[in-house]
């Protein structure tokens, strides 16, 4: 089942996705699409990278992390209720059927009406409650049978909701990571 993330209307949503390049600058193409990951590619592509850089993007979707180091987490700016749904992060590893696919569910909640102004929150994300680690270390590492050189490391945190933009960097240490090479 999809990992669920939450954001409020008007905020920026953050959907984590990572891989570890085999060597600096040796990038693997990645696509983000709206809708569950299909057999190939991404459906309704909202952003794409190639071996060099981001080569397809639209106005509200961007990679704010260091994608050259494998942080291909998607930021959706100024979200609306229509942004709710499943998003696919696809790491397009060379070779037949080698792609890694992650389905992330984004739930957009109506903006809270607050009586007093509060500090702006840039990122909000909820993590599933059945998590296996309390820190930022790997919870488990499993070797993919068909890809002996690629490990899938799943990292999570127990926080139900990130409510402060200064936690964005912590968030980048969370999520799913593919190591290549």
């Amino acid at each position: 089942s999809e990992v669920e993330y939450r954001a409020e209307v008007g905020q920026n949503a953050y959907l984590p996705c990572f891989y570890t390049p085999a060597a600096p600058g040796n990038l693997v193409p990645v696509c983000w699409g709206k809708g569950a990951c299909p057999v190939f590619e991404c459906g309704n592509v909202v952003l794409r990278t190639d071996e060099r850089d981001v080569n397809y993007w639209t106005s509200r979707y961007w990679l704010n992390g260091d994608f050259r180091k494998g942080d291909v987490s998607l930021t959706i700016e100024n979200v609306t209720l229509a942004d709710s749904g499943i998003y696919c992060c696809r790491i397009q590893i060379p070779g037949i059927m080698n792609d890694e696919k992650f389905n992330l569910k984004l739930v957009i909640k109506p903006a809270k009406v607050t009586p007093a102004p509060t500090r702006q929150r840039d990122f909000t994300a909820a993590f599933p409650r059945m998590l296996t680690t309390r820190g930022h270390g790997p919870a488990e590492t499993q070797t993919l049978g068909s890809l002996p050189d690629i490990n899938l490391t799943q990292i999570s945190t127990l926080a139900n909701e990130l409510r402060d933009s200064r936690l964005a960097n912590d968030l980048r240490d969370s999520g799913a990571t593919i190591r290549i090479g």
Partner: antibody, heavy 118, light 110 residues
């Protein structure tokens, strides 16, 4: 508000190279995520995307024009330039520069008429 | 022949709604949320109406709306006004970093 202004010769001889410049005001051509584009409107083919240069300097070209097209930029002058080589009368038309935050749409300049004739 | 297919002309009655279609493929309209619509009056540059399928450009009234279903995009104009008489073009990103346009639709307001 970003403003675009195309400039260049209105008349070019066949087999020569067409060179057009787009001067950008009200914003920098290196602004993150911006895409700076050339589009033309010809009597024969209607609106046709020619190519683009991204905020990063990376260029993209129409497959049908790629062999004849070059797009470059001068960040000190906040300009980007289209060069189209080996022109023929079929390249006659209005050439527009345009911009947007990504690939989702275009805000256009006013356009400049180019005629290819001997 | 244009890469995206639009009807050459449509007509609508003052105050009513008209819809212009734009047919593409899974490599452009169907695969990406980068459909845009433009209005061009005689002798002027195209003006952005809709970007990214359904987002109105700044200053565009909500009489103009965009949508997409499968490989076909649509522009709807409600409460037709005489000044809406113009040529309308669709465009879409296409795989491999290319952009394609429709052939244009001439809208006549009756």
């Amino acid at each position: 508000q970003v403003q675009l202004q195309e400039s260049g010769p209105g008349l070019v001889k066949p087999s020569q190279t067409l060179s057009l410049t787009c001067t950008v005001s009200g914003g920098s051509i290196t602004t993150n995520r911006y895409l700076w584009t050339w589009i033309r409107q010809t009597p024969g083919k209607g609106l046709e995307w020619v190519g683009a240069i991204a905020y990063s300097g990376r260029t993209y070209y129409s497959p049908s024009l790629k062999s004849r097209t070059s797009i470059s930029r001068d960040t000190s002058k906040n300009q980007f330039t289209l060069q189209l080589s080996s022109v023929t009368p079929e390249d006659t038309g209005v050439y527009y520069c345009a911009h947007f935050t990504g690939w989702g749409g275009y805000y256009w300049g006013q356009g400049t008429q180019v005629t290819v004739s001997s | 022949q244009s890469a995206l297919t639009q009807p050459p002309s449509v007509s609508g009655t003052l105050g009513k709604t008209v819809t212009i279609s734009c047919a593409g493929t899974s490599s452009d309209i169907g695969g990406y949320n980068s459909v845009s619509w433009y209005q061009q009056l005689p002798g002027t540059a195209p003006k952005l109406l809709i970007y990214e399928v359904n987002k109105r450009a700044s200053g565009i009234p909500d009489r103009f709306s965009g949508s997409k279903s499968g490989n076909t995009a649509s522009l709807s104009i409600s409460g037709l006004q005489s000044e809406d008489e113009a040529d309308y073009y669709c465009a879409s990103y296409r795989s491999a970093n290319n952009v394609v346009f429709g052939g244009g639709t001439k809208l006549t307001v009756l």
